[in-house]
Every structure is written in C-alpha cells, then in structure tokens.
Amino acid sequence: EQAPGTAPCSRGSSWSADLDKCMDCASCRARPHSDFCLGCAAAPPAPFRLLWP
C-alpha cells in the first residue's frame, strides 16, 4: 500500500490517515463516516461518461 505523498490510491480506493493505508470506497456504504470517504466523494471510482455538447 502507498505511503501518503507518493502515488495515489488505485481507482475505487482512498487514503485513510486513521488506518494509514488505502481503503475501499465501496465500504463507505456501510461506514460513511470513515475519514477516507471524503476522498471517495471527491474522486468517483468510475470515469464519467461525457455528454455530447
């Protein structure tokens, strides 16, 4: 697992300072108050489908 300040967590995960490791954003459904869930909200796990102009 990455240390903070190096490469970001993989897609679908976010860094937890509390646990000192990358954590699954999917777990925020069960534990929405986890520290890393804020990072999940800011970076959706799947790319957006671009709308036609």
Partner: antibody, heavy 119, light 111 residues
Framework: QVQLQQSGGGLVQPGGSMKLSCIAS????????MSWVRQSPEKGLEWVAE??????????HYAESVKGKFTISRDDSKSRFFLQMNNLRAEDTGIYYC??????????WGQGTDLTVSS | DIVMTQTPASLAVSLGQRATISCRAS??????????MHWYQQKPGQPPKLLIK???SLESGVPARFSGSGSGTDFTLNIHPVEEDDTATYYC?????????FGGGTKLEIK
C-alpha cells in the same frame, strides 16, 4: 504481519456452554468489525455474529439461528474478542473461525477451532 | 435472507484451461456503482482466503489469473490459466445486508 489466534473449542454436551477467544495482532484492531463464521458439512460456511467498532457503538448482530444463545464481545485494550455460546445443540457442531472486516468482506481469518456438541 | 446459489458444485478443468464458477443471488446486491459480492478460496485444513472483493477487485497478492465480473444478481469467478495450486473449494459471499450469506461452494479439481 496480521494474525488472528483462536482458542477454545472441543467437546461439549448438549445444553452445555463454551467460550471462544480470538487475539488479534498486526492491524488497527479497534477500527475493525469482528465476526465469527462457522463451517459444517451440512450447512457450509455460515456467518454467526458480528461486533462493530466503538465508532459504531459496539453494535452487535447475530444470525437468527443463534440469537439468544450466543453473545459476541470485544476488548479493544487487549485486541481480543469472544464468542460465548450457551445451550449448545448438535447443529452447532462445526469449525468456528474468527474474522475481521472493515466492512463487507472477511479479510483476515483465524486458524479455526473445532466445536463438537455430543453426548 | 439473500440466498446464494453457486454452480457447478464441482468442476474438473485441464491444466492451463479456464475455470468458470457462477454465483446467483436471490436479490440484487449492487448499487449503481458497486456490487457487494466477494469470492474466497479454501484449501483443506485452512480458513478461506479472500480473492476478489466487490465483484471484480483483485485482492492484493492474488494472481491476475483470477478475475471476477457481474452485477445485480449474477456473478462469475474466472481462473485462467488454471494451475495445480488452484485445487480448492471456492465460495461467493454477499455483504448487501445482514445476515451475510455464502454460496454452497464449488470444488475445483485440476486434470
């Protein structure tokens, strides 16, 4: 290195009691939810009970088949948790595993301990 | 309770070929973003070992020969190419709600 070390188990008569213990090391125990999962040839893998973390008010959940019979508890200061089993019956026979989960999947597992309920 | 139905119950696959194991949940275990389905491998005398989480996310340290797919009620575990060491029983598990339930297992034999 993560370890879940189990103790307890053995042979107990129907109607009897048994307490299983699990000591954790190598991860932030207090942040994790802890479960007991049992396995038997008849029922396969069966989730039994869960105790959540302090931030979740140590909420407990049980399989319907063990409600009122089993009690799960934890001691964060010593990184250990327990399963107190009362009024045991033959259908409670199996291998009992302790396991940790942050949420959703069972990440780390103990080595398993055998419980036999028989006269 | 959500019932997990795994097929087949047993499977024999030649070395180097593909093994496909299916798991069907009695109701959807997916949101628009994630599927709450997980796969484990168990060898005799050992506890289960996590392989795949959230339907398709490979657990750290698990070989890329293992892959998972599916959403809603239907999920698949693929192993390709299979190796001798893959002889084991494989289980699916949902975490959509309590009680968490497991499939009945698929015993994989390598020919």
């Amino acid at each position: 290195q993560v370890q879940l070390q189990q103790s307890g188990g053995g042979l107990v008569q129907p109607g009897g009691s048994m307490k299983l213990s699990c000591i954790a090391s190598g991860f932030t125990f207090s942040s994790y939810w802890m479960s007991w999962v049992r396995q038997s040839p008849e029922k396969g893998l069966e989730w039994v009970a869960e105790i959540r973390s302090k931030s979740d008010n140590y909420a407990t959940h049980y399989a319907e088949s063990v409600k009122g019979k089993f009690t799960i508890s934890r001691d964060d200061s010593k990184s250990r948790f327990f399963l107190q089993m009362n009024n045991l019956r033959a259908e409670d026979t199996g291998i009992y595993y302790c396991s940790s989960t942050y949420a959703d999947y069972f990440h780390y597992w103990g080595q398993g301990t055998d419980l036999t309920v028989s006269s | 309770d959500i019932v997990m139905t795994q097929t087949p119950a047993s499977l024999a696959v030649s070395l180097g070929q593909r093994a496909t194991i299916s798991c069907r949940a009695s109701q959807s275990v997916s949101t628009s973003t994630y599927s709450y389905m997980h796969w484990y491998q168990q060898k005799p005398g050992q506890p289960p070992k996590l392989l795949i989480k959230y339907a398709s996310s490979l657990e750290s340290g698990v070989p890329a020969r293992f892959s998972g797919s599916g959403s809603g009620t239907d999920f698949t575990l693929n192993i390709h190419p299979v190796e001798e060491d893959d002889t084991a029983t494989y289980y699916c598990q949902h975490s959509w709600e309590i009680p968490y339930t497991f499939g009945g297992g698929t015993k994989l034999e390598i020919k």
